[in-house]
């Protein structure tokens, strides 16, 4: 099949890094500077992506593969192949049209990107709130109130993690 195809179409013999040059009677020509073809049989080479502005180069372009971009610090990628860079916010915030805004009460965001999400409703699972939620953290659900009735084995909540430089209250 390959042999038949190459007899019918001389361009199918052109390897990655080349294009089938109509100006040269369909012989394979290497891609010109700052262009690439990642597969064989191409009739043109594609212009290399340039990572400018808020984009930075993660992988340089070559004659056989496009450049890959990511975002400068303070921004994160969105879209296929990092087609956009979006501003980071702090944990406990979300990005709005007016910039980074704190999560409303009852919601949290534990990442520098994305939206604030509602705290888990422990009672829907018949459980109680063991650790209250914050803007940065979801609530921690504990055993159901019935499990904490007298006689039931009590669960000791984990001690809250101390931050460096803070003495115990």
């Amino acid at each position: 099949f390959e042999r038949t195809r190459s007899l019918q179409d001389p361009c199918s013999n052109c390897p990655a890094g080349t294009f089938c040059d109509n100006n040269r009677n369909q012989i394979c020509s290497p891609c010109p500077p700052n262009s690439f073809s990642s597969a064989g049989g191409q009739r043109t080479c594609d212009i290399c992506r340039q990572c400018k502005g808020v984009f930075r180069t993660r992988k340089e372009c070559s004659s056989t593969s496009n450049a890959e971009c990511d975002c400068t610090p303070g921004f994160h990628c969105l879209g296929a192949g990092c087609s956009m860079c979006e501003q980071d916010c702090k944990q406990g915030q979300e990005l709005t049209k007016k910039g980074c805004k704190d999560c409303c009460f009852g919601t949290f965001n534990d990442q520098k990107r994305g939206i604030c999400r509602p705290w888990t409703n422990c009672s829907l699972d018949g459980k109680s709130v063991l650790v209250n939620g914050t803007k940065e953290r979801d609530v921690v659900c504990g055993p159901s109130p019935a499990d904490l009735s007298p006689g039931a084995s009590s669960v000791t909540p984990p001690a809250p993690a101390r931050e460096p430089g803070h003495s115990p209250q």
């Epitope: 010109p32 500077p33 340089e60 004659s63």
Partner: nanobody
């Protein structure tokens, strides 16, 4: 413009080796991509090996493992080392960069 002159062709037995040279003169700073092509009698000119603009050497399947392309910028020369030559490697070999072509050098593989 760039002028290219090939040399190093000749008659060699199957399994033998040859080293072709392509000397460049003129505005050689224009040379980002340099290629070797060949044309056998009655056939279309075909790409054999090239040094791409990113300075990586590439080969068509028929040349892989047998031919080596290299460049010596101080001598303004590109080489094609051809080992394990076969009868079907018989052709005129041309050096190319952009729109500039050399005059070609004949390689004949014959027993």
């Amino acid at each position: 413009a760039v002028q290219l002159v090939e040399s190093g062709g000749g008659l060699v037995q199957p399994g033998g080796s040859l080293r072709l040279s392509c000397a460049a003169s003129g505005n050689i700073f224009d040379i980002r991509v340099i290629s070797w092509y060949r044309q056998a009698t009655g056939k279309q000119r075909e790409l054999v090996a090239w040094i791409a603009w990113d300075n990586v050497a590439h080969y068509v399947d028929s040349a892989k493992g047998r031919f080596t392309i290299s460049r010596d910028n101080t001598k303004k020369t590109t080489y094609l080392q051809m080992n394990s030559l076969k009868l079907e490697d018989t052709a005129v070999y041309y050096c190319n960069s952009g729109d500039s072509w050399g005059q070609g050098t004949q390689v004949t593989v014959s027993s």
